[in-house]
């Protein structure tokens, strides 16, 4: 194996770095961009989709969770399969699963089917990161591997920018919708979901023009196929550099003898499904065996260390980046509540209300023979009030409640004042006629504040760019470990600044700082993961670690967001501790700079 690694490195040096790698860079970049988009889709559509699908808080939470769950399963599944079936083939299948279900999710109406489609879409895209980095690394010579893998990371950021820009451009346009009958509605947020499937679709199209990794062929004893691909790399680069006359000098390459080739069954043995069943079981066994070998004596220490680093990095990064917008919303809510107007003991008779009431509390009021027509109630509370001989028509409300109120001889026509909005209230001889249909839940809706999140995400993802460039340029100069540990320490320090963020703009600025600093850790971690494992375990290990990363993300998000409105100290302390632990673990890993790809 060592001999193969050395020879392969020499061949890649002969092939050079040129047009072939840059073409592959953009193709795989699209696949990585699709992953960057996926993380944001659900978060961006929730403010609009919650009304359409009538989502409760638990439904919304489940929708956010399901994407990570899908990506977790996908990373492990496709990562394991890519070491057995090939990088290109598995990436094509996983992206196809992603784009098909992302496409379907744009059209399905029910919450359950939307959830299912997003789950499978997540399973599909889960294969992107583990396969893309392994695949690209196998076309890169040692000299610039770290730098070019880091440039590839930039596409994840581009995916986030694309998602935020598209959300900003599409979702607020309610006009971009149509209705078929009374049941089928296609609103602008669905157009956004559809547009978010484009990177994946384009990646599939572009990937069909690319060859399989020659290193995978060699690991599986396919010498001729590997030679053909390497010749293609050489010839493409030489033609582009203006040396078409240069001949690919390699004639023979070492190959690994395959011991556990897929079991082949005679076609006359049993039914087709039995044959496929045996093949699937055999393949599953090999994938599982390969995964367990990552915990074998040779790799156990590395795997456990990497698990620690991936977990702590993900826990703090995802925890904080989801906690930020929640914290901003909390600050907005606190500010909004501070501006609430209170009207005590008012007595109103024979008055017609036909305007908007917002952010008010009416206490101990008496309303006689009043008409509330075409009224918009936004964050209004009526407490201990009496409504007698009143008439409500065409009233729409959000975050509005009637607490301990009494209604006598009152008529409600075409309102959305559903039962739960009357808390400990008495209705005497009162009638509800033609209540508004649709979602009976109070949804936060799609006000300016809801769209603000697109802009914040846009800024936050864009802020990663300087960190990405710096880390790419320094990756091969200072080494992966210094980059990882240094960036983690800087992230840890930037975490403490969060304590001083008491305004919306300060929090956004700190989000950008944290994202910009921590990206270098992610880049270093991706490069390290690729280089620490041999080619026959590379995507399996990467897939497993990426699955663990998604689990850590879910835990981080759950724990951090539970402190919103309670304390800022706990999430900052958790994140700092995790980052400190991660950087100390990272320093115990072996440096891979200057090594040939095993």
């Amino acid at each position: 194996r060592e001999e193969l690694a050395q020879q392969y490195e020499a061949i890649l040096r002969e092939c050079g770095h040129g047009r072939f790698q840059w073409t592959l860079y953009f193709v795989l970049g699209l696949a990585l961009m699709a992953d960057g988009v996926e993380v944001f889709v659900v978060g961006f559509v929730l403010p609009s989709a919650e009304k359409d699908m009538c989502l409760s808080d638990s439904n919304k939470g489940m929708l956010g969770l399901i994407v990570y769950l899908g990506m977790m399963v996908g990373a492990f599944l496709w990562g394991g399969l890519a070491d057995r079936l090939g990088r290109r083939q598995c990436l094509l299948i996983s992206l196809s699963v992603n784009s098909v279900f992302a496409f379907f999710s744009s059209f399905v109406q029910g919450y359950g089917t939307f959830l299912f489609c997003r789950l499978l879409s997540g399973v599909g895209i889960g294969g992107s990161i583990p396969i893309v980095f392994s695949y690209f690394s196998e076309f890169l010579a040692q000299e610039k591997r770290g730098e070019h893998l880091s440039w590839l990371c930039m596409f994840w950021m581009i995916g986030g920018v694309y998602a935020a820009a598209m959300a900003w451009a599409i979702i607020p346009h309610y006009g971009w919708s149509f209705q078929m009958g009374s049941a089928y509605q296609f609103h602008s947020w669905r157009v956004f979901v559809l547009v978010c499937a484009f990177p994946s679709v384009f990646a599939i199209g572009a990937l069909t023009t690319q060859p399989e990794s020659p290193r995978f062929f060699l690991e599986n004893g396919k010498h001729d196929e590997a030679w053909m691909v390497l010749k293609q790399v050489h010839d493409t680069n030489m033609r582009a550099k203006g040396h078409p006359e240069r001949v690919f000098s390699v004639t023979h390459i070492k190959t690994i003898h395959q011991e556990d080739e897929l079991i082949e069954i005679q076609s006359d043995t049993g039914a087709w499904y039995q044959r496929w069943g045996v093949r699937a079981l055999s393949l599953g066994g090999q994938v599982w065996g390969n995964f367990l070998s990552c915990f074998g004596p040779e790799y156990r220490r590395i795997t456990l260390m990497m698990m620690g680093v991936w977990f702590t990095m993900s826990f703090s990064y995802y925890g904080l980046t989801v906690w930020f917008p929640d914290m901003i919303r909390h600050l907005q809510a606190v500010d909004y509540a501070a501006r609430t107007k209170v009207f005590p003991g008012e007595r109103v008779e024979h008055v017609t209300f036909n305007f908007t009431l917002e952010n008010q509390i009416h206490r101990g009021g008496q309303y006689f023979n009043d008409k509330f027509i075409g009224l918009r109630l936004k964050s209004v509370s009526f407490e201990d009030s009496l409504f007698e001989e009143c008439y409500f028509e065409d009233v729409t409300s959000s975050n509005t409640f009637f607490r301990n109120c009494t209604f006598i001889n009152t008529v409600f026509y075409n309102t959305d004042l559903f039962e739960y909005k009357f808390v400990n209230s008495r209705l005497v001889n009162s009638t509800f006629l033609h209540n508004k249909e649709g979602c009976p839940l109070d949804v936060t809706g799609t006000g300016e504040g809801a769209y603000m999140v697109y802009f914040v995400s846009f800024l936050g993802t864009l802020a990663v760019l300087p960190g990405n460039i710096v880390s790419a340029l320094l990756m091969d100069k200072i080494g992966r470990l210094r980059m990882l540990a240094g960036s983690s320490v800087m992230s840890c320090v930037s975490c403490f600044f969060l304590s001083f963020g008491n305004s919306e703009s300060a929090m956004i600025a700190l989000l950008c700082l944290f994202g910009g600093v921590s990206i270098a850790s992610w880049n270093a971690l991706d490069v390290l993961t690729v280089e620490l494992y041999p080619s026959d375990k590379r995507t399996t290990a990467f897939g497993f670690l990426n699955a663990l990363c998604k689990l850590a993300a879910v835990l981080g998000i759950s724990i951090f967001t539970s402190f919103v409105g309670i304390t800022k100290a706990a999430p900052i302390l958790f994140a700092s501790a995790a980052l400190a632990l991660g950087s100390s673990l990272a320093l115990k890993l072996p440096e891979t700079r200057g090594q040939v790809l095993q």
Epitope: N369, K371, N409, Y413
Partner: nanobody, 119 residues
Framework: QVQLVESGGGLVQPGGSLRLSCAAS????????MGWYRQAPGEQRESVAS???????TYADSVKGRFTISRDNAKNTVALQMNSLKPEDTAVYYC?????????????WGQGTQVTVPP
């Protein structure tokens, strides 16, 4: 006191049409809303369609595109044109009205008219 009288119910084949009418009489002050509810055997009364002053209409999702409500404010009458009828439209249809009197809103109901669409 206001009286509401419905007419036009009957038996109609699936896919057929029917027109229900309702006339209000008595001391009407300001007839703000007129509309229709229906009640199938063993079911709760459900909203069908209504029309408020200013020709603002509301329809239940189940009848949108098939039923049309119209109103003559001068005569205080309301009509419901029902097309593409289905067996699930079988019910007693009740006319209702909301009169905004000097003393507050008053809701009035008709006796109901039977509509049957055999399966």
């Amino acid at each position: 006191q206001v009286q509401l009288v419905e007419s036009g119910g009957g038996l109609v084949q699936p896919g057929g049409s029917l027109r229900l009418s309702c006339a209000a009489s008595g001391s009407i002050f300001n007839m703000r809303v007129m509309g229709w509810y229906r009640q199938a055997p063993g079911e709760q009364r459900e909203s069908v369609a209504s029309m408020a002053s200013g020709d603002k209409t509301t329809y239940a999702d189940s009848v949108k595109g098939r039923f049309t409500i119209s109103r003559d404010n001068a005569k205080n009458t309301v009509a419901l044109q029902m097309n593409s009828l289905k067996p699930e439209d079988t019910a007693v249809y009740y006319c209702h009205a909301v009169d905004l009197t000097r003393n507050g809103p008053r809701v009035y109901w008709g006796q109901g008219t039977q509509v049957t669409v055999p399966p």
